[in-house]
Amino acid sequence: CDLPQTHSLSNRRTLMIMAQMGRISPFSCLKDRHDFGFPQEEFDGNQFQKAQAISVLHEMIQQTFNLFSTKDSSATWDETLLDKFYTELYQQLNDLEACMMQEVGVEDTPLMNVDSILTVRKYFQRITLYLTEKKYSPCAWEVVRAEIMRSFSLSANLQERLRRKE
């Protein structure tokens, strides 16, 4: 599965779209910063078989899609950019799903690491809770946008490891 070449391009486009989505300068939102506890260890890729790594990436993108598909999200971001963002995420999900199908039967290990998937979900639950507590304020969304950009940027490291595993 030649995931990384198609996928990393889409990842970079996703980052650029997210960068353009900003509505308020982060300089104005310093007080709203929050440590969501990004599960870095789940994206280190050392302990994973390829299929498990792909499933973790898939979960992160799926959760991001869910987060930005809410009514509150639609009211916050530019519609055109949001549509572009959805398109890129959808493309990445398709790439990953196709890749996962190719991995079926290739490895003896399970296709997904349930603990890792749960860890990613809990991370997104913390983000959702933060937004709720902050009443979906512009600065809260700015903090979340920056966090998701950072997580996409860090997940690129896992993609690099997958490329080297090819």
């Epitope: 353009q20 300089f27 310093l30 007080k31 940027s153």
Partner: antibody
Framework: QVQLVQSGAEVKKPGSSVKVSCKAS????????ISWVRQAPGQGLEWMGG????????NYAQKFQGRVTITADESTSTAYMELSSLRSEDTAVYYC??????????????WGQGTLVTVSS | DIQMTQSPSSLSASVGDRVTITCRAS??????LNWYQQKPGKAPKLLIY???SLQSGVPSRFSGSGSGTDFTLTISSLQPEDFATYYC?????????FGQGTKVEIK
Amino acid sequence: QVQLVQSGAEVKKPGSSVKVSCKASGGTFSSYAISWVRQAPGQGLEWMGGIIPIFGTANYAQKFQGRVTITADESTSTAYMELSSLRSEDTAVYYCARHLEYAFPDKFDYWGQGTLVTVSS
Amino acid sequence: DIQMTQSPSSLSASVGDRVTITCRASQSISSYLNWYQQKPGKAPKLLIYFASSLQSGVPSRFSGSGSGTDFTLTISSLQPEDFATYYCQQSYSTPLTFGQGTKVEIK
């Protein structure tokens, strides 16, 4: 390899303006913040303001509001700081400093070499 | 604006000494404090961020601690290259503000 290269030293008359440039390399220019920090001779550090190129709009310290303009040109990966109505107390070394990519602009991770601006009649 | 006050403003020490510099904020800044080292004619260099996290490439003899309003930078065993001026900086809110600096000189 991240690098910030600033324009050369300037000597200016009181009342005039100065524009200092900062050319960045390494990383995606549009998506990280660049701040300007100045240091008067023998004095401490003072944050003037900052910009995230993709936003276009800058944030300024109240002290410099109305006198400083920070801009960024994405096509050349260059940030600019223009200070107007110069007075002798504006004599200082002006630094551009880069914040980490995809992070909040809270710490100055990389610095330019500094540009000495001397205001003298 | 948040005022940052460093003490002492200067100190003399010998190679191998343990050196402590303190920084006090005029209001609580959680752990949003950074430390920089500056040598004459050079740009500052980030040492510690978020009060206690060591910047990549910085020797482990440098450490930071504190939260709220009181913070400390410690150099466990002073080396010849550590003679410089040290600044704290709050990143809790804009304007980002620095302490006035602490000059570490050779005794």
